[in-house]
């Protein structure tokens, strides 16, 4: 984990100010509105299954 202003998060992750840690961009599939998803190259929209399983 890292603080803002230091080295960036590892590949495939992005800094979350809300959670104060690096988070996996992969989780943006399930939670696309997370603050850190803005820092991910491409956050695909949540599929319908996650909203109406």
């Amino acid at each position: 984990e890292q603080a803002p202003g230091t080295a960036p998060c590892s590949r495939g992750s992005s800094w979350s100010a809300d959670l104060d840690k690096c988070m996996d961009c992969a989780s943006c599939r399930a939670r696309p509105h997370s603050d850190f998803c803005l820092g991910c190259a491409a956050a695909p929209p949540a599929p319908f299954r996650l909203l109406w399983p």
């Epitope: 988070m23 996996d24 961009c25 992969a26 491409a42």
Partner: antibody, heavy 119, light 111 residues
Framework: QVELVESGGGLVQPGGSLRLSCAAS????????MSWVRQAPGKGLEWVAE??????????HYAESVKGRFTISRDDSKNSLYLQMNSLRAEDTAVYYC??????????WGQGTLVTVSS | DIQMTQSPSSLSASVGDRVTITCRAS??????????MHWYQQKPGKAPKLLIK???NLESGVPSRFSGSGSGTDFTLTISSLQPEDFATYYC?????????FGGGTKVEIK
């Protein structure tokens, strides 16, 4: 440090009810999805139920095996997760684990509480 | 529902051995970018512990001798040099859709 502590397990007769609780600390509980996962004696892991966030209107999802009998709920003001279990069957006998995760992989696990359904 | 098939169900190995466990999903659990497959370790009488998420991302604090690979339907957990504390049962789990399902487990025993 992260801690999840389950309670409420015990011996109950078939057809009976039990309410499990899970007290969470060490992480932002209100931001994390929560699930119950169970493990029958000597068997593997089985996902039971999930509850999402206030922003998701506390959406819930259940395994077919417990749908209509179990109800998952949470109280973010108390950092607590619950599982109301009704119409219990012998096959519900298991250790029940409380798990927390931002999404996908279950990062945090409690120590488990044993539920025994037997006459 | 997506079925998860783990193999072998058990194996005997010695300290220092390279151990490989496989998990096959009944349908793809990957996008073009990520795989929604995770691995857990469970020791007797203890709760499972997350080792690897998204097929290959090592969880913080997990020794580097553990690694994960795969995409689509076929995934592998590898322990490069088995240590005494690694004797446990390992489970895979997908998070592609609800219901989440786990593999049947692989028990790693001492030879």
């Amino acid at each position: 440090q992260v801690e999840l502590v389950e309670s409420g397990g015990g011996l109950v007769q078939p057809g009976g009810s039990l309410r499990l609780s899970c007290a969470a600390s060490g992480f932002t509980f209100s931001s994390y999805w929560m699930s119950w996962v169970r493990q029958a004696p000597g068997k593997g892991l089985e996902w039971v139920a999930e509850i999402r966030l206030k922003s998701d209107n506390y959406a819930t999802h259940y395994a077919e095996s417990v749908k209509g009998r179990f109800t998952i709920s949470r109280d973010d003001s108390k950092n607590s997760l619950y599982l109301q279990m009704n119409s219990l069957r012998a096959e519900d006998t298991a250790v029940y684990y409380c798990t927390g995760y931002y999404a996908d992989a279950m990062d945090y696990w409690g120590q488990g509480t044993l539920v025994t359904v037997s006459s | 529902d997506i079925q998860m098939t783990q193999s072998p169900s058990s194996l005997s190995a010695s300290v220092g051995d390279r151990v490989t466990i496989t998990c096959r999903a009944s349908q793809s659990v990957s996008t073009s970018s990520y795989s929604y497959m995770h691995w857990y370790q469970q020791k007797p009488g203890k709760a499972p512990k997350l080792l690897i998420k998204y097929a290959s991302n090592l969880e913080s604090g997990v020794p580097s001798r553990f690694s994960g690979s795969g995409s689509g339907t076929d995934f592998t957990l590898t322990i490069s040099s088995l240590q005494p504390e690694d004797f446990a049962t390992y489970y895979c789990q997908h998070s592609w859709e609800i219901p989440y399902t786990f593999g049947g487990g692989t028990k790693v025993e001492i030879k």
